[in-house]
Each structure stands twice: as structure tokens, then as C-alpha cells.
Amino acid sequence: AANKRKNQNRNKSSSHQDSSRMSSVGDYNTSEQKQACKKHELYVSFRDLGWQDWIIAPEGYAAFYCDGECSFPLNAHMNATNHAIVQTLVHLMFPDHVPKPCCAPTKLNAISVLYFDDSSNVILKKYRNMVVRSCGCH
Amino acid sequence: AANKRKNQNRNKSSSHQDSSRMSSVGDYNTSEQKQACKKHELYVSFRDLGWQDWIIAPEGYAAFYCDGECSFPLNAHMNATNHAIVQTLVHLMFPDHVPKPCCAPTKLNAISVLYFDDSSNVILKKYRNMVVRSCGCH
């Protein structure tokens, strides 16, 4: 599960919903410590998304997500682009003008989904960019 | 110049610095309106970064940066990945557990830089991923 922390790098909704079905996901804004950009656990249930009536299989999948700080200095683990490195330096100088780079997927994998199309035909389709393989500062 | 707005999707420093040299950059957190993810103006001066003694040319470059909200629904302009679409839906359901996707470059361009290396040799090098061409939700 994702480590619990407060992450001010993201928008937080004031709405608190029941999270019993999200057992694989840590509460991303409950601790004061800000972690560096990294990959976090996230299991997505197609039932939770309301897609259970048209997706046959799988029931869900390990999607993961990216979150964390992209602060100076950006080390090698951050998979930072040259632009992100420059933006980090500009943010250091002008923090109210330019935001820090954000933590986003750098590599994504596909998954195969078996589903009913609009004509109730069973289709096996590969959906690209569904699973986070790695995260970085962009 | 970048439009002025408050963007809660980013960490903001309380440090206020002189921004006279950053004429191409709007203050990204001064207005209440939250804009959608898009490309913003940013001219980076190598002098401001303290690189003027080793970079011969150019003096600086139009780097641009990405900023803004990645909120439901993600439209076509958002260049969202499948993972970002899924993450947006999960965030709608569990806003305190999973952050929204973040606004990051989807395409980057290179620039050529003429500089002195550590041995004082003049090098012309193409630096990849220096200029934002387009932004999207990731």
C-alpha cells in the first residue's frame, strides 16, 4: 500500500468517501511528510468504476499511480527530463511564477480486456497505457 | 505571458523574489480561477540560472511549461492517457486516496547549445527534451 502522507503537490477534495473498497491504496494526504516522486500501489476495480456490466474480464487490475515531490535536486531516480531539471531551477528562483515539475508516469504498460461492445459482441482488446511501470518528474 | 491564477495542484513557496527578469511568466498562483491543463509561456535566461560563464549561446530560450487542472471530464485537448482517464475516475470516487493526474509535457523539443566543457573546449550539443511542445494529463 502507498505510504500515508500529506502531499501538497496535488489538489485535494473536501469530500470524504467510504474507502473500504480501496484497501490497496494509502491515504495520500494524511501525514505531514512529503515523499519524493515515486510509484504507488493502486488496484482499480472495474466494479467500483461501474463498468462491471460490460467488462467481462479482468475484474480489475493493478494500475498504480505516481505521486510525490519533484524538488531540487532531482536525482537519477526521478527520471527527470532536461526540461524538468531546468524548470526545477527556475522554480527555485521564482517559486511564485513557475511551479515545480510534476510526478507523472514515464513508462506505461497495456492490459488486455474482454468486454461486450455496443452490439453485445465479445471483444478482446489491448488497451495501451493502462499500467504505470515507472514514474518521473516532468 | 502566462495567465495569472491560483493553482492548488502545486506546492507554493512562501518566498517572494524579485521577478523583474521573468517578464514572460505570469504569477501562477494569484487568481482564484483554476485553469485547465495547458502550455504556458516561459523564457529561461541562462544568466538567471548562473550558467552564463560556460554557455556561449544561446543566451536563453523559450522553454514553456505545463500547468493547470486535470479534472473530470478529461476532454480531447487534455491529451490524456488511458491511465490518466482511469485515475481521474478513481479520484472522483476516492479524492483523499488518489490524486488527480498531473499536467505535464506530452511532447518536447530539443535545442542546440554552444558551451565550454570542463577542459574549456567549445562544444555544440543538441539537448533533448528542453522545450515543451504540448501538455497533457498524465
Epitope: - | 544568466r47 552564463q52 560563464d53 556561449i56 549561446a57 544561446p58 543566451e59 542546440s112 547549445v113 554552444l114 565550454f116 577542459s119 574549456s120 573546449n121 567549445v122 562544444i123 555544440l124
Partner: antibody, heavy 121, light 108 residues
């Protein structure tokens, strides 16, 4: 068309500071590197250093401890100061422009006509 | 620093003849960052060639430059009376920027 004109005293006493100014006309001093080169009588050329209009400098190492090049963009001028001069610093001093882009760098064009500075008591 | 050695020191030729001037670098000059200048007595040097082989604006096509690495050549295909002068090479591929000692082309 851009023109460069050196000015300053033609005679400097040993141990004193040589001061020269180069006035640029026909073009803005902005966006270029501006250089000083010298030529002792009957000898070859020696690069002294350059300044970018924004103020960054680079000097020839043997002269670095004695040289200061500065720029005044409002007057479209740049200047050379060479301290603790000796007779070996007697030379014709030239100012010149260096192009400054990734495709145009490092050669001197145009040059000022030069000014002879003699170091003697 | 890169030391540039020019040869010969003096070249005695007649108008109409071909002049070949050599400039040899103590180490490789990156990206052919080499220029040639002409200097007449009492005058400032004038840029002839940059980038080892590109003619500067207004320079007659009888002047040509060639070479790369450590060996560079300035060729004057047919000497005109106004070409008799001192010629300097200069490298700008490394700091400090350096000049060769010069080659004097004199009338034979």
C-alpha cells in the same frame, strides 16, 4: 554598418593601470561578445579576453589576474583595464566583435583600427 | 591551450602565383573552429575565412580555406598586388582563443 573605435591614453607609466574604451556605433552592443586583442610592435596577435553585453567575461589565463573588461550598454561601450603594467604590455590594442549564436561564434569581425599604448616612465 | 604554428614564416611569390599557407594545431581544433585573417601594415586584421572554409562577406573567391583536426590551409589561387600582407590563423574551438604566429606573403 558596425564600427568600433578605441580610445584612451597612449602613454602609461610602469606599475600603473592601462585603461581603454571601445565605442560601438552602427549597431547595439547587445547580443554580442566584445573582445580585446593586442599586438606588440612587430609581433603577433594575443587575445586578452571578452565580455558579453550582459556582463559575463572570459580572460586569457596569463593575463587574468590583471585584466578587467566591463560593459556600459547605455553608452554602447566596453572597456579594458590592465593593471600593474610593464614595458612588455606595450602594444597596439584592438577591440573587436565576436558573433554569438550556435552557428556563428569565435571569430573577430569587425575590428577597431587599434590604438598604440606605450608603457614607459 | 592550443598552440598554432604557421608555416612558412615568409612566402616570397610573384603576382599571379598560387600561395599555400599552413596552420598546424598542437591538438585537434573541434568542429573546424578556425579562422584566417589578413593584416596589412598599419591596419587592423581583416577576417577572410571562418569555420575553416567559409569565406567572410566581401572576400574574393580566390581565397579559400580547407582542413580539419590539426592541419589547416589557406590558399590564394592567384595573388593580386593587394594580397601581399601578413596572414594569421586563429582557433576558437577552445579557450583561450589563440592565434598563429603569422605568415608574411611578400613580393618576390
Amino acid at each position: 554598418q558596425v564600427q568600433l573605435q578605441e580610445s584612451g591614453p597612449g602613454l602609461v607609466k610602469p606599475s600603473e593601470t592601462l585603461s581603454l574604451t571601445c565605442t560601438v556605433s552602427g549597431d547595439s552592443i547587445s547580443s554580442y561578445y566584445w573582445s580585446w586583442i593586442r599586438q606588440p610592435p612587430g609581433k603577433g596577435l594575443e587575445w586578452i579576453g571578452y565580455i558579453y553585453y550582459s556582463g559575463s567575461t572570459r580572460y586569457n589565463p596569463p593575463l587574468k589576474s590583471r585584466v578587467t573588461i566591463s560593459v556600459d550598454t547605455s553608452k554602447n561601450q566596453f572597456s579594458l583595464k590592465l593593471s600593474s603594467v610593464t614595458a612588455a604590455d606595450t602594444a597596439v590594442y584592438y577591440c573587436a566583435r565576436i558573433c554569438s549564436s550556435t552557428s556563428c561564434w569565435g571569430w573577430f569581425d569587425p575590428w577597431g583600427q587599434g590604438t598604440l599604448v606605450t608603457v614607459s616612465s | 591551450e592550443i598552440v598554432l604554428t604557421q608555416s612558412p614564416g615568409t612566402l616570397s611569390l610573384s603576382p599571379g602565383e598560387r600561395a599555400t599557407l599552413s596552420c598546424r594545431a598542437s591538438q585537434s581544433v573541434s568542429s573546424s573552429y578556425l579562422a584566417w585573417y589578413q593584416q596589412k601594415p598599419g591596419q587592423a586584421p581583416r577576417l577572410l575565412i571562418y569555420g575553416a572554409s567559409s569565406r567572410a562577406t566581401g572576400i574574393p573567391d580566390r581565397f579559400s580555406g580547407s582542413g580539419s583536426g590539426t592541419d589547416f590551409t589557406l590558399t590564394i589561387s592567384r595573388l593580386e598586388p593587394e594580397d601581399f600582407a601578413v596572414y594569421y590563423c586563429q582557433q576558437y574551438g577552445s579557450s583561450p582563443l589563440t592565434f598563429g604566429g603569422g605568415t608574411k606573403v611578400e613580393i618576390k
